[in-house]
Interface confidence: medium
């Protein structure tokens, strides 16, 4: 349905307050440096502009498309070329190719500094200014995450604001917020981790990608849906997600809100799950529709294999109509296994499409692919073999000591990664132990694997900025459903050339007595990649040995009355004693 | 729910023609595989003809292939089943069946399809 003008469009569907701050999440996500009140001036001038747009649509300008109207935005920022130096270059192109090159421009990993929560700070920002906290915390997130899913931010920024609501007014204001933002920073974490796996699958692997994990995905949800309303449901969600991670955020929201209408009107047919959410006002209803557990599988569903290996139809069902049939194969495969990953599902699929391939082309195709289930074990066996291997470690380990496992197996595969990379990446999988672990056998594959996806997915994008490991890269672009499997699979690097030793690295001050647990960890974990780096060789006793060592320094000269002192005469002791060990 | 209605059938003599019809209510017949099977006395059903939902893939038994064609016609949600040459071991029940929300496959196996009609009676006999 085409409007005259585009922006009034939007500003009428969305409403001023969820059209600010999409305009203002999409400002902040393309120009990650600079200040807030520079970013609500801008927002500022195109809502007045949508206003006037609204009271008349004819009014000059107002049928401008939506690219055009932001990219001219922020082509007025005067200190473009200073702060982005070759973005300003892409204020010389015509649309479409000038919103191109400014979602080329976006920086996964933006030189910002950490949000360190100070409770009273906060409770007086909010309570000056509710609206602005608002936006604070919008432009704040967006900045740093620049493929945070837009209308989900929205969700989180409200939510942000209502523990402020509830806390500001509590007696130990820190005991209130800080283990309720810290709950909602892990789950923000985890939220942008997933769109950026969802937008790096589109970008590297096109919308295909997207549609058959969401046919999976959806599939395991709703497994009472038919095929054609679940394959509905996946061509307006890619719709969606297409748009978001292509900066189109007010489109992106709206389609998002006429979605989550959609399925509340026909949840009869999709899910007996759904009645909650759909009481819910939009956001909540969208968030809850997104976290919806997996409803019932139907009974008496008849055996995949009927369909899919004793049928003698199969290679002309195939042949005549390969998307359909595969995507029939996923998605009756995805709802009778609620237990399975989708990343297996997805190389279940594969597997089957690579099967049929062979099968199809030979005088007796029935015979070749009446076994293909048997052929398929053995992707589900993989996974679960890992899952109990890892676990078993984690739980003799616990996270801290997992995580450290974690960064020798990882720092000798890929030794030419950046430390703060190694370190990064190896401390989120060692998280999995934390949240995957514990969970029931039922749910461990699906926590595991997924998460595994965007932890992987992490590394290849930061990877993609500077490529140093034509291993990473390999696994990173062959097979997006095979890249964990890959990595996996990675043995240690024989061709690396060790890194001279350098003391400045081990070289440590008092100010890192005073730091939090988990900073003197990362510390610690980056000593640790840094001396494998050095020694890749270092057999596990020896290891051992250095970081007890190290941490024997730390904690005798964080004790000492003059710790600068301490540091500066034990340090130098602790690299000699350090290649000692290593010797 | 899928409510599905043959008629057609009838007493044709061998070599004649007869067109059956199936008209579907409760969901478009285009989004549903959909086929016909047929039923002797004292004999089990037996697959004769199919067309997938969303694709118009056509599946047929060996014994009808060439003679029966298996069509739809969506704006009417009616499935057909034309049939030419027939013999006198074509005499049986002739059933509509219904496998919603399936893409394009059209299994052979009865059990597989949730949905049928009452039947419609086809006898080829001089």
């Known amino acids: 349905d085409t409007h005259k003008s585009e922006i009034a469009h939007r500003f009428k569907d969305l409403g001023e307050e969820h059209f600010k701050g999409l305009v203002l999440i999409a400002f902040s996500q393309y120009l990650q440096q600079c200040p807030f009140d520079e970013h609500v001036k801008l927002v500022n001038e195109l809502t007045e502009f949508a206003k006037t747009c609204v009271a008349d649509e004819s009014h000059a300008g107002c049928e401008k498309s939506l690219h055009t109207l932001f990219g001219d935005e922020l082509c007025k920022v005067a200190s473009l070329r200073e702060t982005y130096g070759d973005m300003a270059d892409c204020c010389e192109k015509q649309e479409p190719e000038r919103n191109e090159c400014f979602l080329s421009h976006k920086d996964d990993s933006p030189d910002l500094p950490k949000l360190k929560p100070d409770p009273n700070t906060l409770c007086d920002e909010f309570k000056a200014d509710e609206k602005k906290f608002w936006g604070k915390y919008l432009y704040e997130i967006a900045r740093r995450h620049p493929y945070f899913y837009a209308p989900e931010l929205l969700y989180y920024a409200n939510k942000y604001n209502g523990v402020f609501q509830e806390c500001c007014q509590a007696e130990d204001k820190g005991a209130c917020l800080l283990p309720k933002i810290e709950t909602m920073r892990e789950k923000v974490l985890a939220s942008s981790a997933r769109q950026r796996l969802r937008c790096a699958s589109i970008q590297k692997f096109g919308e295909r990608a997207l549609k058959a994990w969401s046919v999976a995905r959806l599939s395991q949800k709703f497994p009472k849906a038919e095929f054609v309303e679940v394959t509905k449901l996946v061509t307006d969600l890619t719709k969606v997600h297409k748009e978001c991670c292509h900066g189109d955020l007010l489109e992106c929201a709206d389609d998002r809100a006429d979605l989550a209408k959609y399925i509340c009107d026909n949840q009869d047919t999709i899910s007996s799950k759904l009645k909650e959410c759909c009481d819910k006002p939009l956001l909540e209803k969208s968030h809850c529709i997104a976290e919806v557990e997996k409803d019932a599988i139907p009974e008496n569903l008849p055996p995949l294999t009927a369909d899919f290996a004793e049928d003698k139809d199969v290679c002309k069902n195939y042949q005549e109509a390969k998307d359909a049939f595969l995507g029939s194969f996923l998605y009756e495969y995805s709802r009778r296994h609620p237990e399975y990953a989708v990343s297996v599902l997805l190389r279940l699929a594969k597997e089957y499409e690579a099967t049929l391939e062979e099968c199809c082309a030979k005088d007796d195709p029935h015979a070749c692919y009446s076994t293909v289930f048997d052929k398929l074990k053995h992707l589900v066996d993989e996974p679960q073999n890992l899952i109990k291997q890892n676990c078993d470690q984690f739980e003799k380990l616990g996270e801290y000591g997992f995580q450290n496992a974690l960064i020798v197996r990882y720092t000798r595969k890929v030794p030419q990664v950046s430390t703060p990379t190694l370190v990064e990446v190896s401390r989120s999988l060692g998280k999995v132990g934390t949240r995957c672990c514990t969970k029931p056998e039922s749910e461990r594959m699906p926590c595991t694997e997924d998460y595994l996806s965007l932890i992987l997915n992490r590394l290849c994008v930061l990877h993609e900025k500077t490529p140093v490991s034509e291993k990473v890269t390999k696994c990173c672009t062959e097979s997006l459903v095979n890249r964990r499997p890959c990595f996996s699979a990675l043995t240690p690097d024989e061709t690396y050339v060790p890194k001279a030793f350098d003391e400045k690295l081990f070289t440590f001050h008092a100010d890192i007595c005073t730091l939090p647990d988990t900073e003197k960890q990362i510390k610690k974990q980056t000593a640790l990649v840094e001396l494998l780096k050095h020694k890749p060789k270092a057999t596990e006793e020896q290891l051992k040995t250095v970081m007890e060592n190290f941490v024997a320094f730390v904690d005798k000269c964080c004790a000492a009355d003059d710790k600068e002192a301490c540091f500066a005469v034990e340090g130098p002791k602790l690299v000699v004693s350090t290649q000692t060990a290593l010797a | 729910e899928v409510q599905l209605l043959e008629s057609g059938g009838g007493l044709v003599q061998p070599g004649g023609s007869l067109r059956l019809s199936c008209a579907a209510s409760?969901?478009?017949?285009?989004?549903?595989?959909v086929a016909w099977f047929r039923q002797a006395p004292g004999k089990g059903r037996e697959f004769v003809a199919g067309i997938g939902g969303g694709v118009d893939i056509t599946y047929y038994a060996d014994s009808v292939k060439g003679r029966f064609t298996i069509s739809r016609d969506n704006s009417k949600n009616t499935l057909y089943l034309q049939m030419n040459s027939l013999r006198p071991e074509d005499t049986a029940v002739y059933y509509c069946?219904?496998?919603?929300?399936?893409?394009?496959?059209?299994?052979?196996?009865?059990?597989?399809?949730?949905?049928w009609g009452q039947g419609t009676l086809v006898t080829v006999s001089s």
């Open positions: 409760g969901r478009y017949i285009d989004e549903t595989a």
């Open positions: 069946a219904a496998r919603p929300g399936r893409p394009l496959i059209t299994s052979k196996v009865a059990d597989l399809y949730p949905y």
